[in-house]
Every structure is written in C-alpha cells, then in structure tokens.
C-alpha cells in the first residue's frame, strides 16, 4: 500500500445564484498522476454520492447536482487525493453549503438620463442552469435591497451611498454635469448572504439633459 497520501488541506464552496463551485487546495508534493475524488452529501439523505473519481483540476462545478439547493437543507462535500492505488483521507467542507452561502450578485445595471435624474434599472441574474420556476425573485421573494454607490468622474473617489428596496431607482444629480459611475450590491434584509459589488456602469450627463422650466 506504500505511504499514505496527505489529504487536501482545505475544501470549500464558492457560489452565486445557480453557479455552485467546490474548491480545494492541492496536497503538498503532488505528482503528475495525482487526481482528486469528489463526493457529495445531501442533508436528509445520509449517504455520500461519488461525483467525480479523478478530477485533475482544483475545482469542480457542482451546480447540476445541487439544483435543489434553494429548496433543501443543504449539502456537504468531501475531497480526497488519489494516486494510482493510493488515496488520502477525506477532507470535508467545514460548513454546510446552503442558500445562506450563496453570494448575491446582480445580472447587470442599466442607466439612462431623464430630466437631470439618472434612472437605474437592476437586471437580476438569469443563469441558464436555473430551473424555469426558480427565478431570483421567486427564491428571494421578499426584502430585496440594493446598496448603490455613485461617484462623479473626475473625482477624488469619495462615494455617495444610497440603499434602495426596488430594482428601479433614481439618482438626483443636483444639476451637476459630467460622468457619473454607479455600482450596485444586492442584499436580502432577512438573510445573512454576502453580496458582490457589480462592475461600474457609467453615464455622461451634459446640459442637454436638463429641461428648462419657467
């Protein structure tokens, strides 16, 4: 049987809405023939299900086998190193992978200008893997909130922050002209999920966008 292989030092999930990735760190001094076995346990069904016998990557997309995450008690995963006939002990994720572990994101942010206001529309994520009935707004049906960060370009990177409770928002520019850049971070007030800031979207506001009224 030879010397025992060391176990992967760390195993954890990183996830966005219907994008569930298991990660692990490699064993020290792994050889070119070292690979990793991945198994999954669904809470309530107390048996481990082998997902991959020999993955040579250090991450594995488990979305397809965890599609019921948002209607379940969650999962644990475990990984072990395999090299020929030798294998290590399992390393198990040290937290339950549940809906609480999903990082919230937005699909995109669209900006337009009307009467000196910046009007924003937040597009929610629409992942291809999601079952038809499992939309972001049906799973997170209440208390959706969005932190809005605005900066004026050129500027000294001081942000104006605002929290909104709808996917549509408006920002008053106080008659200023220039380029305004907006980022959005979603949250759900009743949940503890982390949120990821969106990429910045920018829009230029010039005098032509202001309506003159007597």
């Amino acid at each position: 049987h030879g010397t025992e292989l060391p176990s992967p030092p760390s195993v954890w999930f990183e996830a966005e809405f219907f994008h569930h990735i298991l990660h692990w760190t490699p064993i020290p001094n792994q050889s070119e023939s070292t690979c990793y076995e991945v198994a999954l346990l669904r809470y309530g069904i107390e048996s481990w299900n082998s997902i991959s016998n020999c993955s040579q990557t250090l991450s594995y997309d488990l979305t397809a086998v965890t599609l019921d995450l948002y209607h379940s008690n969650g999962y644990r995963a475990r990984v072990r190193a395999v090299d020929g006939s030798r294998h290590s002990n399992w390393t198990v994720t040290n937290t339950r992978f549940s809906v609480d572990e999903v990082t919230l994101t937005v699909g995109s942010v669209n900006l337009e200008i009307h009467n000196g206001f910046i009007l924003g529309k937040i597009q929610l994520p629409r992942p291809k893997m999601a079952p038809a009935n499992d939309t972001y707004e049906s799973i997170f049906s209440h208390f959706r909130e969005y932190e809005i960060a605005i900066r004026k370009v050129p500027g000294n990177f001081t942000f104006t922050h605002k929290k909104v409770k709808h996917e549509n928002f408006s920002l008053l520019t106080s008659g200023e002209v220039g380029e305004f850049c907006v980022q959005v971070k979603p949250s759900v007030a009743s949940r503890s999920n982390k949120g990821m800031w969106s990429k910045e979207e920018c829009i230029s506001l010039t005098r032509q966008y202001f309506t003159v009224t007597n």
């Epitope: 760390s10 954890w12 966005e16 569930h20 760190t25 991450s59 980022q183 971070k185 949120g195």
Partner: nanobody
C-alpha cells in the same frame, strides 16, 4: 470602484528576495480571493499564486512553489507576495488581481479587477 495598487518591485540579483504589496482601496471592496499573475517580456500573462480572502487556502504555480509565499492582511485590505531565491526567469511585470467569480483560482477569467503592475527584474 476597486483600485489595486502594487508596490515593491525593482532590480534584484539572482538568489535575492523582494516583497510585493498590493493595496486594495475604494469602499466597494468585495472579492472571493486575491491573486498574483506575471507577464514576462514578449510572453502572455501567467498565474503565480492566489489566496482565499476569507478562510484558509493558497495556490502556487509549480515554478514558484517553495520560493514564493502569498499572504494577506484583511484589516488593511492588503495582499503580499514574498519572493525568495529569485531567478532570471522570474523577471516580469507582476499584477495583483481580485477574484470576483466563483470559478477557478488559477484562471485569469475569474479575476474582475487588476492593478497596473510592478516590474521585477532579476539580473546580475
């Protein structure tokens, strides 16, 4: 907007050491992890090392294993790369990047924010 600013590059003799730093600024810092990539003159950008931002877990390219050490200071939003036993083939521009996708730590595509880079030259 997240800004990443690398520092610590310079000219060093073979066998010498350098410590690179990357300061993340801007109130909108959020990332799964952070990484270092490098681009040697006339070559493509390659993965060097990465670290989880919350929790334990580090990755290294085979070419730097045992010589480079990645670390972080969450309270300062700062990433480090301690580079020992430097070789001529380590000469490159080193880029710090923030991982904003749950996909692989080793892939450039997982990183949504990049610094401007700092030059490391290893020469006698």
């Amino acid at each position: 907007q997240l800004q990443l600013l690398e520092s610590g590059g310079g000219l060093v003799q073979p066998g010498g050491s350098l410590r690179l730093s990357c300061a993340a600024s801007g109130r909108t810092f959020s990332a799964y992890g952070m990484g270092w990539f490098r681009q040697a003159p006339g070559k493509g950008r390659e993965f060097v090392s990465a670290i989880r931002w919350f929790g334990e877990g580090t990755y290294y390219a085979e070419s730097v294993k045992g010589r480079f050490t990645i670390s972080k200071d969450n309270s300062k939003n700062t990433l480090y790369l301690q580079m020992n036993s430097l070789r001529a083939e380590d000469t490159a521009v080193y880029y710090c990047a923030a991982k904003t996708s749950p996909t692989s730590y080793l892939s450039e595509k997982s990183y949504g924010y990049w610094g401007q880079g700092t030059m490391v030259t290893v020469s006698s």
